[in-house]
Amino acid sequence: AIVFIKQPSSQDALQGRRALLRCEVEAPGPVHVYWLLDGAPVQDTERRFAQGSSLSFAAVDRLQDSGTFQCVARDDVTGEEARSANASFNIKWIEAGPVVLKHPASEAEIQPQTQVTLRCHIDGHPRPTYQWFRDGTPLSDGQSNHTVSSKERNLTLRPAGPEHSGLYSCCAHSAFGQACSSQNFTLSIADESFARVVLAPQDVVVARYEEAMFHCQFSAQPPPSLQWLFEDETPITNRSRPPHLRRATVFANGSLLLTQVRPRNAGIYRCIGQGQRGPPIILEATLHLAEIEDMPLFEPRVFTAGSEERVTCLPPKGLPEPSVWWEHAGVRLPTHGRVYQKGHELVLANIAESDAGVYTCHAANLAGQRRQDVNITVATV
């Protein structure tokens, strides 16, 4: 008869660690030993394999190794078969997951004074205990504006307010070990009394004596204050304008208008919004005065008939960047043909005697226009 000297026994195991289910048999003749898992034969793999009559696990897996193992001994001559007692693993494991928003259904629905529930998706066996953190600081049970229980994976903020804003993470620990959230959740709850930007001023470039407008708007409840400052922290109001900003007007909607702009008005303008609570918001924009420098002189050119030549016009430095074009006999040159403009270049292909004359490079921007002539002579061979 086949006798089991050692039978497998149920045991605790740790996810990913080694384990061994022992089985030893004694029989009058040779026997063939194999293992069943939930009644199905166990195939050897690198992770789980027969070691003599025992079953060895290089790394226990909570999904593949859950169930009932049985050691079976069979005498292939007589057909006699004996089965061991059932054995199973109590696998201890812990697996990290993200912090997710459980309530409300989407971030867009989070409003001040509503209840917000976050869920820590760390699972394990035995059931882990949870610890929540906001911006890396542990949250304890004793605080009145949130409910957290180390046994529960949920964190409830009721009612949620701006003070709850921050990065939420969680950690869990059990007999197996510890794991922390693989992805954290940023909760952002606006304080209605904090100033928020609605419209930010943009840099502007204007010609001398023209007008410039900066738009700036903030929102808050109650409505925020708005103030304009220039360069040296000089406040600009309709009542107290600094001497160099006599032609400045601040509108009720926050826009700042500067008329008859002069060089001394160029610089950085700051728009400052202040809510009932929270820090001031400072937005900056620069007023540039348009400018255009002179163009370098061209040397006269002598070209040979039949050749192809180019004359590059160097655009003058200017703000905004000047546009450049070529003219001949008062007519702007086309972008293709035999004599044409390409970018800043004047191109003369297969030069003819009739191409001789004065060609003018023009450059223009808000500040004005500059021009420079080049005299082209065509030499015939």
Epitope: F298, R301, T312, L314, V324, T335, H336, K342
Partner: antibody, heavy 117, light 111 residues
Framework: EVQLQQSGAELVKPGASVKLSCTAS????????IHWVKQRPEQGLEWIGR????????KYDPKFQGKATITADTSSNTAYLQLSSLTSEDTAVYYC??????????WGQGTLVTVSA | DIVLTQSPASLAVSLGQRATISCRAS??????????MNWFQQKPGQPPKLLIY???NQRSGVPARFSGSGSGTDFSLNIHPMEEDDTAMYFC?????????FGAGTKLELK
């Protein structure tokens, strides 16, 4: 505002071809040249060639002749660079640039071409 | 082809100090009184940006601390005073004739 928008990164097999695009906004490509420049990882800049989109005239650095073909479609304001018989040596970022003269005054963001089996 | 030799290959300069990068052409890049030498700045992951064209002409919108000089075959780019934002690769390029050619580049770092 002048902008050059290049097509996305390409992963191609050795021996294959690839066609990169460069679409201009804020100006007509007919009015300028469009240049193409190659930059291998951690290396310098190499001029491939240029096209005059108004007439299709193209010029190349001799070392890119046969490897690169530059074309343009003025109706879509787009220039193209076709690279053929690709090898690992062609792995690089390829830039298009607007040339108001023979220099790039505005550049595209670049297209990374990776040649790998 | 016109070969451009840039030096030094790398340069470390303290804030507020002067950085000078040189570029020598294998032949003159002058044509009718214009030196066709340009300078570009390139930061990691970005395309090159034109700073100076025709040896000494500052591109619109480029800070005044960038200046270019030279003629014929010898050119230089000066940056003064050096700022943190100027850490980048700098390339010279000749645009006198096709094929257009670039220098090998100078890596400018903060000391």
């Amino acid at each position: 505002e002048v902008q050059l928008q290049q097509s996305g990164a390409e992963l191609v097999k050795p021996g294959a071809s690839v066609k990169l695009s460069c679409t201009a906004s804020g100006f007509n490509i007919e009015d300028t040249y469009i240049h193409w420049v190659k930059q291998r990882p951690e290396q310098g800049l190499e001029w491939i060639g240029r096209i005059d989109p108004a007439n299709g005239n193209d010029k190349y650095d001799p070392k890119f002749q046969g490897k690169a073909t530059i074309t343009a479609d003025t109706s879509s304001n787009t220039a193209y660079l076709q690279l053929s018989s690709l090898t690992s040596e062609d792995t690089a970022v390829y830039y298009c640039a607007r040339g108001d003269a023979n220099y790039g005054s505005y550049w595209g963001q670049g297209t990374l071409v990776t040649v790998s089996a | 082809d016109i070969v451009l030799t840039q030096s030094p290959a790398s340069l470390a300069v303290s804030l507020g100090q002067r950085a000078t990068i040189s570029c020598r052409a294998s032949e003159s890049v002058d044509h009718f009184g214009v030196s066709f030498m340009n300078w570009f700045q390139q930061k990691p992951g970005q395309p090159p940006k034109l700073l100076i064209y025709a040896a000494s002409n500052q591109r619109s919108g480029v800070p005044a601390r960038f200046s270019g000089s030279g003629s014929g075959t010898d050119f230089s780019l000066n940056i003064h005073p050096m700022e943190e934002d100027d850490t980048a690769m700098y390339f010279c390029q000749q645009s006198k004739e096709v094929p257009l050619t670039f220098g090998a580049g100078t890596k400018l770092e903060l000391k």
